[in-house]
C-alpha cells in the first residue's frame, strides 16, 4: 500500500550523527525509526476504518517536523501540534483506560475488552509506543547514538514532550466514567510525578468526566490488603475531588483471573471478587 513509494520519497539524511557530536545520557533513536513509524501508520490505518483516510506520508512529515533540525532539549508542545492534528482520533470518550506503571496489563486488557482504549490503542500512541527519537540543532540528521535522558539531561526532549502532549489530549477527550489501572506493587501506587499523575489527572474535564475509577492491581497471590486505603490513593482521591470529579477505587486481587473473567464473563468463578 504505497509504502515503498513513501520510503523512496524520503530525502532526509537518515545517517547516524557522527560519534564526535553531542553525547546524551539516554539511548539513541530506535533503529529504522522512519520506516517503523511509517509501517505502523500504514498498518493502523488499514485496520481502523475511522482512520483510513489519514495520509501516512503527511503524518510522517508532521512527526519529523516536530524534532528534526531542532535542539533536542528545546522541544515544545507546539512543535507537535501538526502531528496531533493529523492524528486527531474520535475514540468513545466513555471507554478510556488510563494506566500508570502497569502498561502490559492495561494493554492485555484492551486487547480482550475491545471497546476500551488505552493511549497506545490510538494512532499516535501506537506509532510511538516503545520508540525513542531525537535530532539535533541545525542538521537534518536523526541521532541514532544518544538522546537526552529526562532526568540526567533535560525534560523538554522529543520523546517526553510527545508523551506529555498526546497524554494531555487523550485525557481532555475523556468523558463519563474514566478508568485508571494502577500498580499496587509499587511503593507509590499513585505517583504525582508519573504521566498519569502530572498530566492526565489535571486534564480530565470536570464538565465531561463524572467519575474516575481506579483499579489497583495486586502483585502477590496472598495479598489481601485493601490497597484503596493506601495514602497515595487517598492523595489521588483528594486531587480528583478538588476538581469536582467523583472518585471510586477497586482492588484487583488476582490480575490473571481478572483477565480470564474479562475473556469469559459467564464463567461461574467470575461472580466472586477478583
Amino acid at each position: 500500500s504505497g509504502l515503498n513509494d513513501i520510503f523512496e520519497a524520503q530525502k532526509i539524511e537518515w545517517h547516524e550523527v557522527p560519534r564526535w557530536r553531542q553525547q546524551w545520557s539516554g539511548p539513541g533513536t530506535t533503529k529504522r525509526f522512519p520506516e517503523t513509524v511509517l509501517a505502523r501508520c500504514v498498518k493502523y490505518t488499514e485496520i481502523h476504518p475511522e482512520m483510513r483516510h489519514v495520509d501516512c506520508q503527511s503524518v510522517w512529515d508532521a512527526f519529523k517536523g516536530a524534532f528534526i533540525s531542532k535542539h533536542p532539549c528545546n522541544i515544545t508542545e507546539e512543535d507537535y501540534q501538526p502531528l496531533m492534528k493529523l492524528g486527531t482520533q474520535t475514540v468513545p470518550c466513555n471507554k478510556i483506560l488510563l494506566w500508570s506503571r502497569i502498561k502490559d496489563l492495561a494493554h492485555q486488557f484492551t486487547q480482550v475488552q475491545r471497546d476500551m482504549f488505552t493511549l497506545e490503542d490510538t494512532l499516535l500512541g501506537y506509532l510511538a509506543d516503545d520508540l525513542t527519537w531525537c535530532g539535533e540543532f541545525n542538521t537534518s540528521k536523526i541521532n541514532y547514538q544518544s538522546c537526552p535522558d529526562w532526568r540526567k539531561d533535560c525534560s523538554n526532549n522529543p520523546v517526553s514532550v510527545f508523551w506529555k502532549t498526546v497524554s494531555r489530549r487523550f485525557a481532555e477527550a475523556a468523558c463519563d466514567v474514566v478508568h485508571v489501572m494502577l500498580n499496587g506493587s509499587r511503593s507509590k501506587i499513585f505517583d504525582k510525578n508519573s504521566t498519569f499523575g502530572s498530566v492526565e489527572v489535571h486534564n480530565l474535564q470536570p464538565e465531561k468526566v463524572q467519575t474516575l475509577e481506579a483499579w489497583v492491581i495486586h502483585g502477590g497471590r496472598e495479598d489481601s490488603r485493601d490497597l484503596c486505603q493506601d495514602p497515595t490513593i487517598k492523595e489521588l482521591e483528594s486531587i480528583i475531588s478538588k476538581r469536582n470529579i467523583q472518585f471510586s477505587c477497586k482492588n484487583i486481587y488476582r490480575p490473571d483471573k481478572f483477565l480470564q473473567c474479562v475473556k469469559n464473563p459467564e464463567d461461574s468463578s467470575c461472580t466472586s471478587e477478583i
Epitope: E50, D61, K85, T90, T165
Partner: antibody, heavy 123, light 110 residues
Framework: EVQLLESGGGLVQPGGSLRLSCAAS????????ICWIRQAPGKGLEWVAC?????????YYADWAKGRFTVSKDNSKNTVYLQMNSLRAEDTAVYYC???????????????WGQGTLVTVSS | DIQLTQSPSTLSASVGDRVTITCRSS????????LAWYQQKPGKAPKLLMY???NLASGVPSRFSGSGSGTEFTLTISSVQPDDFATYYC??????????FGGGTKVEIK
C-alpha cells in the same frame, strides 16, 4: 488586523485547471493552519484542504479532493494556493480560505475568513 | 462519509423570539464536544459564533448559547435581534483532523 484575500477565480471549462491564491496579512503566517472551504451557489459549506508550514509543508485533504486538488504555500509572499485540476461542473462554488484558531484547545475551528472567490465551471 | 444534519432548514421568527437550531452528527465529534457554529449573511463569509459546543467566540453577544455533546448539539438565540436574521451552520471536527459542515438553517423574519 488579520486579513485573508482570495483571488484567481473565474470561468473555466470542464476538464480545465485553475489556481486560486489566498494572500494573508496581519499575523505570523507560519504559525497557523490555513484551509480552503468552498460553498456551491445556494448550498452549504464544504471543507477542501489545509496546510501548515512551520518548517516543511504539512498538508491534508478531504477524501473527495485528493488527487485533483493540491494546496501549497509561498512563505515569502505570505500566500497559500489551491491548484484545481480536471474541474467539473459540480466544483462551481465560492472558494474561501480561512485561518484556524491557534492553540490546541481551539484547533478545528475557523476564526478568520477571506471574502471568497467564485469559480464557475461551465462550457 | 460523515453527515451533519441541521434542523429545521428554515425557521421563521419575530424579533424577541427564542430560537433553537439542532445539529446531529452521524459520528461522534472529537472529544465529544468539538463542534462550532457559524453565522453567514448573504454575500459574506461565515463568522464564528461558538466553539467547543458551548464557548462563545470573541465579540459574540451573550444571547447566543450552545449545548450538546457527542452527536447532538443545539444553538439557541435567547431573544432574536434584527441583526440575527441569517443562515447558521454547525461544523464538527473528526478523526484525522477532518471537518464537516451541516446543511445550514436559515433564520428569516416572520
Amino acid at each position: 488586523e488579520v486579513q485573508l484575500l482570495e483571488s484567481g477565480g473565474g470561468l473555466v471549462q470542464p476538464g480545465g485547471s485553475l489556481r486560486l491564491s489566498c494572500a494573508a496579512s496581519g499575523f505570523s503566517f507560519n504559525n497557523y493552519w490555513i484551509c480552503w472551504i468552498r460553498q456551491a451557489p445556494g448550498k452549504g459549506l464544504e471543507w477542501v484542504a489545509c496546510i501548515y508550514s512551520p518548517s516543511g509543508d504539512i498538508k491534508y485533504y478531504a477524501d473527495w479532493a485528493k488527487g485533483r486538488f493540491t494546496v501549497s504555500k509561498d512563505n515569502s509572499k505570505n500566500t497559500v494556493y489551491l491548484q484545481m485540476n480536471s474541474l467539473r461542473a459540480e466544483d462551481t462554488a465560492v472558494y474561501y480560505c480561512a485561518r484556524e484558531l491557534s492553540g490546541s484547545s481551539y484547533e478545528g475551528y475557523f476564526e478568520s475568513w477571506g471574502q471568497g472567490t467564485l469559480v464557475t465551471v461551465s462550457s | 462519509d460523515i453527515q451533519l444534519t441541521q434542523s429545521p432548514s428554515t425557521l421563521s421568527a419575530s424579533v424577541g423570539d427564542r430560537v433553537t437550531i439542532t445539529c446531529r452528527s452521524s459520528q461522534s465529534v472529537y472529544g465529544h464536544n468539538w463542534l462550532a457554529w457559524y453565522q453567514q449573511k448573504p454575500g459574506k463569509a461565515p463568522k464564528l459564533l461558538m466553539y467547543r459546543a458551548s464557548n462563545l467566540a470573541s465579540g459574540v453577544p451573550s444571547r447566543f448559547s450552545g449545548s450538546g455533546s457527542g452527536t447532538e448539539f443545539t444553538l439557541t438565540i435567547s431573544s432574536v435581534q434584527p441583526d440575527d436574521f441569517a443562515t447558521y451552520y454547525c461544523q464538527g471536527y473528526y478523526s484525522g483532523g477532518s471537518y464537516a459542515f451541516g446543511g445550514g438553517t436559515k433564520v428569516e423574519i416572520k
